[in-house]
Interface confidence: low
């Protein structure tokens, strides 16, 4: 089975998570992409997705999540603003390519959000709670009508080092199944 690695981000409440998921340019530029959470090795739950087909550099906002797909660079930029402790968890970017299974981009993101420093609101210089301006956006498309058990996996052990290439075929059928708590993808 494909082994997955994690990249850890430790941030304070109110800060912004800003990550970039690389993809194979020619193959996936206009494909619809999504940002998912997997809590404690549970089944992925889609939180936000780009439009279909994905628009170049067009920000899509769902709640506190902003996605921007840069076709020219082959990367999906994901920002989660005004982070809360409850946002802590394991995240991943996926590319939808129906009728095939969604294609998972490596590495997964392990987000740890801790309480900010006590003090006056906004006193933490890294806080984006009051200064971050979310660009005006419109989201025309719901996330895909597609849920894939194939990407359901246990979070890998911390020592895992093997990384699949972005355009490799993912087959996770032999990975232990998970307990599903935030219920469905």
């Amino acid at each position: 089975a494909t082994k997955l690695t994690e990249e850890k981000y430790e941030l304070k409440e109110g800060q912004t998570l800003d990550v970039k998921c690389d993809y194979t340019l020619e193959k996936f530029a206009s494909s619809q992409k999504a940002w998912q959470i997997i809590r404690d090795g549970e089944m992925p739950k889609t939180l936000a997705c780009t439009e279909r087909p994905s628009k170049n550099s067009h920000p899509v906002q769902v709640g506190r999540i902003i996605l921007e797909d840069y076709h020219d660079h082959g990367l999906l930029r994901v920002r989660m603003v005004n982070l809360q402790v409850e946002d802590s968890g394991l995240y991943q970017c996926v590319i939808y390519q129906p009728p095939k299974e969604p294609h998972m981009l490596f590495d997964r993101i392990r987000l740890v959000v801790t309480k900010g420093f006590s003090g006056t609101p906004g006193s933490n210089e890294n806080s984006t709670q009051n200064v971050y301006k979310i660009p005006p956006t419109t989201t025309k498309a719901l996330c895909p009508l597609y849920t894939s058990p194939r990407t359901v996996t246990q979070a890998p052990p911390k020592s895992t080092a093997d990384v699949s290439t972005p355009d490799s075929e993912i087959n996770l059928t032999n990975v232990t199944d998970i307990i599903r708590v935030p219920v469905f993808n």
């Epitope: 939180l47 009508l145 059928t173």
Partner: antibody, heavy 119, light 113 residues
Framework: QVQLVQSGAEVKKPGASVKVSCKAS????????MHWVRQAPGQGLEWMGW????????KYAQKFQGRVTMTRDTSISTAYMELSRLRSDDTAVYYC????????????WGQGTLVTVSS | DIVMTQSPDSLAVSLGERATINCKSS????????????LAWYQQKPGQPPKLLIY???TRESGVPDRFSGSGSGTDFTLTISSLQAEDVAVYYC?????????FGGGTKVEIK
């Protein structure tokens, strides 16, 4: 179009087992979890569990742990739900169900299978 | 488990009048990251499986008449039928999809007065 077709009604004695099938068509069977929900006569809906048709992995409601077994045969796109040690209060209509959107509700349902447990 | 409590148990409304069904969850089903409530509403007619009407608490499923609307957030939700039609006579259920196991409300029977 997506269709879930279930097996016919069953009459069982207390202590016996029943196995209900749910044949899927119109979509990639291994691409979506299959859920089972039951409804006793005149009562509400009760989630029993799900199976990942791709891996065969399952999750069962605590109430049914040890009595329910969910399996699948991918070669014929069919999911199965077996309930053992039947009691009279297991008399119910058993449904298989599938989401369309992820985490957003069951858009597709089987027609239901009535299981009657009576001595 | 999250407990879903529906009220009233039954409701009699005149044709063309508004029907309102309430659903309360024992804990919030709002996912703060995307500001979505993982709550669905179903309609079930006798001898038929349930039919999905609303998901994300307020988004109508494709093909559902616009007289059906859902509202609410967190723990308190409402399904409204703005102008009751004869074909709306059914039992209505809410269901949370936020935490496993997914749980249903006890149902509300809607009849014509």
């Amino acid at each position: 179009q997506v269709q879930l077709v279930q097996s016919g009604a069953e009459v069982k004695k207390p202590g016996a087992s029943v196995k209900v099938s749910c044949k899927a068509s119109g979509y990639t069977f291994t691409g979506y979890y299959m859920h089972w929900v039951r409804q006793a006569p005149g009562q509400g809906l009760e989630w029993m569990g799900w199976i990942n048709p791709n891996s065969g992995g399952t999750k069962y409601a605590q109430k049914f742990q040890g009595r329910v077994t969910m399996t699948r045969d991918t070669s014929i796109s069919t999911a199965y739900m077996e309930l053992s040690r039947l009691r009279s209060d297991d008399t119910a209509v058993y449904y298989c169900a599938r989401e369309r959107h992820s985490s957003l509700g069951y858009a597709y349902w089987g027609q239901g299978t009535l299981v009657t447990v009576s001595s | 488990d999250i407990v879903m409590t529906q009220s009233p148990d039954s409701l009699a409304v005149s044709l063309g009048e508004r029907a309102t069904i309430n659903c309360k969850s024992s804990q919030s089903v709002l996912f703060s990251s995307n500001n979505k409530n993982y709550l669905a509403w179903y309609q079930q007619k006798p001898g038929q499986p349930p039919k999905l009407l609303i998901y994300w608490a307020s988004t109508r499923e494709s093909g559902v008449p616009d007289r059906f609307s859902g509202s609410g957030s967190g723990t308190d939700f409402t399904l409204t039928i703005s102008s009751l039609q004869a074909e709306d006579v059914a039992v209505y259920y809410c269901q949370q999809f936020f935490l496993a196991p997914p749980t249903f409300g006890g149902g509300t029977k809607v009849e014509i007065k």
